[in-house]
């Protein structure tokens, strides 16, 4: 018979003959033959492979090094990585993890309309009109501007996105 | 700084257990298995098992299975080891040491000698 | 069990001295590490993943081998290498050490 020019899902071609990738968790040590199988190798501790594979060494666990802001979010296995996010108050700088940063604080005028988390930056927004933010934060939203007239009371200075309305007494009409 | 202390040099009795901690600071023990290895006077190394402090999961070597029992405490990030049915050749120092991560290398205790005498 | 085989149990070196130890396992394994130890103290992990430096370890310690067959080098012996080396499995359980070899000064 012809000899293939393509294999199925899970094979590799080698030799003019189709061989089973090794699974998950494990590595290669030989191929195929006419007569024997793929031979394949489980990873060690510390170590992974996370698809079918012709790999003659697994991948070492990642390390989440807390000199960089790194904890383990999750230990890897023999299939798969070890995942690291940020401690609290940080985030990671790109999609791979490998370092963090501070969160970002929404300046005064601004308010969180995201709280970051272990992966995403704080998302701030411009306070409306009618609402205010005098603080530097990472977790204060805009608050809104305090209402006089439910207090029975007029207001004295007008608010901005910085400041909170001064409320003081009404005038009253003289007899 | 990271560090593994390990609990102070015992005396014991054959028949009785033993049961030795290793403190872990400078990491978080869940992140980690934590092996156990035993050093003979004058011999060399032996595994005797290990235990992933996140689960309880525990691998023994089958010549101390049933004698040997691993625990771990991650809100002391502590974890312990305890042998039973002690017998002369249990005489040794034993250590606590950590998995590898590049970046690492694994971490030792400073050991812990049992000594088993009547 | 895989049984691991370090030979010589024991050697005599000079300074300057390039050294051969080798471990043998008896299946074939992932990796093996390489520890170092002093009469007295924790053993010293001194290569990972068969032929990985750890950190501060001088590069006259090399590792290789695959397989069952597993070496360690040093190419110019110091007087801090006076030691016991041993070869570990991690691959399979129970995880197993050598037996250790001992380099001794001439």
């Known amino acids: 018979p012809e000899p293939p020019t393509a294999c199925r899902e899970k094979q590799y071609l080698i030799n003019s003959q189709c061989c089973s990738l090794c699974q998950p968790g494990q590595k290669l040590v030989s191929d195929c033959t006419e007569f024997t199988e793929t031979e394949c190798l489980p990873c060690g501790e510390s170590e992974f492979l996370d698809t079918w594979n012709r790999e003659t060494h697994c991948h070492q666990h990642k390390y989440c090094d807390p000199n960089l802001g790194l904890r383990v979010q999750q230990k890897g296995t023999s299939e798969t990585d070890t995942i690291c996010t940020c401690e609290e108050g940080w985030h990671c700088t790109s999609e791979a993890c490998e370092s963090c940063v501070l969160h970002r604080s929404c300046s005064p005028g601004f308010g969180v309309k995201q709280i970051a988390t272990g992966v995403s930056d704080t998302i701030c927004e411009p306070c409306p009109v009618g609402f205010f933010s005098n603080v530097s934060s990472a977790f204060e939203k805009c608050h809104p501007w305090t209402s006089c007239e439910t207090k029975d009371l007029v207001v004295q200075q007008a608010g901005t996105n910085k400041t909170d309305v001064v409320c003081g007494p009404q005038d009253r009409l003289r007899a | 700084e990271v560090q593994l202390v390990q609990s102070g040099a015992e005396v014991k009795k054959p028949g009785a257990t033993v049961k030795i901690s290793c403190k872990v600071s400078g990491f978080n023990i869940k992140d980690y298995y934590i092996h156990w290895v035993k050093q003979r006077p004058g011999k060399g190394l032996e595994w005797m098992g290990r235990i992933d402090p996140e689960d309880g999961d525990t691998k023994y070597d089958p010549k101390f299975q049933g004698r040997v029992t691993m625990t771990a405490d991650t809100s002391t990030d502590t974890a312990y080891m305890e042998l039973s049915s002690l017998r002369s050749e249990d005489t040794a120092v034993y250590y606590c040491?950590?998995?590898?991560?590049?970046?690492?290398?694994?971490?030792w205790g400073q050991g812990t000698t049992v000594t088993v005498s009547s | 069990d895989i049984q691991m085989t370090q030979s010589p149990s024991s050697l005599s070196a000079s300074v300057g001295d390039r050294v051969t130890i080798t471990c043998s396992a008896t299946?074939?394994?992932?990796?093996i590490l390489w520890f170092q130890q002093k009469p007295g103290k924790a053993p010293k992990l001194l290569i990972y993943s068969t032929s990985n430096l750890a950190s501060g370890v001088p590069s006259r310690f090399s590792g290789s081998g695959s397989g069952t067959d597993f070496t360690l080098t040093i190419s110019s012996l110091q007087p801090e290498d006076f030691a016991t080396y041993y070869c570990?499995?991690?691959?399979?359980?129970?995880?197993?050490f050598g037996g250790g070899t001992k380099v001794e000064i001439k």
């Open positions: 570990q499995q991690r691959t399979f359980y129970p995880y197993t």
């Open positions: 299946s074939s394994v992932s990796y």
């Open positions: 040491t950590t998995s590898y991560y590049v970046g690492t290398y694994g971490y």
